[in-house]
């Protein structure tokens, strides 16, 4: 499978909410022995590999924000901890995987990465990730609502080992 990032850039005004999205593409194994570990974290555009560095989102680590579920299930974070920080990650039946950030501030600007690990416990792991930029703006130049910029097809279907 691959991870697509439908949008590579989100430009939002301060105080707005935004939902960053990744999408699983291609065949997804729905066997009973297959589970998916999905999470989000902040990173920086490394010279060697984007998303190699894992930094917290609003002080929450990728482990705090992770989901795990079977291949055919939906899931979302019900952690009070995440919601207290204005965050919620979710995954649906159609391969969409998102994180919602509420009440954005300038400090939320940066590179965000989604990570998906397909796990056949004791057998195999397949990891892919996607990256997108969030720019939070303030003042007269800020948009009134979030503006999203589609990824090029090359970017959005790029498979990268995490």
């Amino acid at each position: 499978f691959k991870v697509a990032t439908p949008y590579s850039l989100y430009v939002c005004p301060e105080g707005q909410n935004v939902t960053l999205t990744c999408r699983l593409l291609g065949p997804v194994d729905k066997g009973h022995d297959v589970t998916f570990y999905k999470t989000w974290y902040r990173s920086s555009r490394g010279e060697v590999q984007t998303c190699s560095e894992r930094r917290p989102i609003r002080n929450l680590t990728f482990q705090d924000l992770h989901l795990h579920h079977g291949g055919h299930q939906a899931a979302n974070t019900s952690h009070d901890l995440a919601q207290r920080h204005g965050l919620e990650s979710a995954s649906d039946h159609h391969g969409n995987f998102s994180i919602t950030m509420r009440n954005l501030t300038l400090l939320d600007s940066g590179l965000y990465c989604c990570l998906v690990v397909e796990i056949r416990h004791h057998h195999s792991e397949h990891r892919v990730h996607g990256a997108m930029e969030l720019q939070v703006q303030t003042g007269k130049d800020a948009p009134s609502n979030c503006v999203v910029y589609p990824s090029s097809s090359q970017d959005s279907e790029n498979i990268t080992a995490a």
Epitope: D33, T35, Y37, T39, F62, Q63, H66, H68, L115, V117, I119, H121, H122, H123, S124, E125, R127, A162
Partner: antibody, heavy 112, light 111 residues
Framework: SLEESGGRLVTPGTPLTLTCTAS????????MGWVRQAPGKGLEWIGI?????NIYYASWAKGQFTISKTSTTVDLKITSPTTEDTATYFC??????????WGQGTLVTVSS | DIVMTQTPASVEAAVGGTVTIKCQAS???????LAWFQQKPGQPPKLLIY???TLASGVSSRFKGSGSGTEYTLTISGVQCDDAATYYC????????????FGGGTEVVVK
């Protein structure tokens, strides 16, 4: 069944390789883990090689141990043993949920 | 690092009584991959329970596992002399790299 071998008395810093030999099943179909137990102490997970060949180690074990696999054996190399590595070393088969089959263990003593 | 805390470290039980052992993980165990092992001196560990509550083949139904997330329990009912041993919990974690961890063990002494 599983049988560990290679345990012996070694001096600190002398590399040592332990071998786990399987009989009655194919190693290529299973994950294989290594666990150790110091005298009078509890079980301590060292690492595992899963079916695809990926190898994972406990954070404390990285650099100290190397796991490798052939068609008939799984090896654990202790790169530079210290007295703290004195223990019985077990290999165990990963059965998809946990470790369902264990060897009897082999004793490694590190002493100068 | 993952820490698995087992309590109590030692427990005394009368024949026919009940023993409860608790295992608490510092992070949520992945997909309920939590097992319990019994070990007697000079022997390798023996699997009792896997997936938190599934009894391993050939194991007495007097052993019962329960729990989810970070907290798990092993209950031994109708304790017998042969149950005298050390019991360990073992959990699997993906963070996101694979890690297994063992609890510190609980010694069960049967009176």
């Amino acid at each position: 069944s599983l049988e560990e071998s290679g345990g012996r008395l070694v001096t600190p810093g002398t590399p040592l390789t332990l071998t786990c030999t399987a009989s009655g099943f194919s190693l290529s179909s299973y994950a294989m883990g290594w666990v150790r137990q110091a005298p009078g102490k509890g079980l301590e997970w060292i690492g595992i090689i899963i079916v695809s060949g990926n190898i994972y180690y406990a954070s404390w074990a990285k650099g100290q141990f190397t796991i490798s696999k052939t068609s008939t054996t799984v090896d654990l190399k202790i790169t530079s043993p210290t007295t703290e590595d004195t223990a019985t070393y077990f290999c165990a088969r990963g059965d998809g949920y946990t470790y369902g089959l264990w060897g009897q263990g082999t004793l490694v003593t590190v002493s100068s | 690092d993952i820490v698995m805390t087992q309590t109590p470290a030692s427990v005394e039980a009368a024949v026919g009584g009940t023993v409860t052992i608790k295992c608490q993980a510092s992070q949520s165990v992945y997909s309920r991959y939590l097992a319990w092992f019994q070990q007697k001196p000079g022997q390798p560990p023996k699997l009792l329970i896997y997936s938190a509550s599934t009894l391993a083949s050939g194991v007495s139904s007097r052993f019962k596992g329960s729990g989810s997330g970070t907290e798990y329990t092993l209950t031994i009912s109708g304790v017998q002399c042969d149950d005298a041993a050390t019991y360990y919990c073992q959990g699997t974690f993906y963070i996101p790299d694979y890690i297994d961890g063992f609890g510190g063990g609980t010694e069960v002494v049967v009176k």
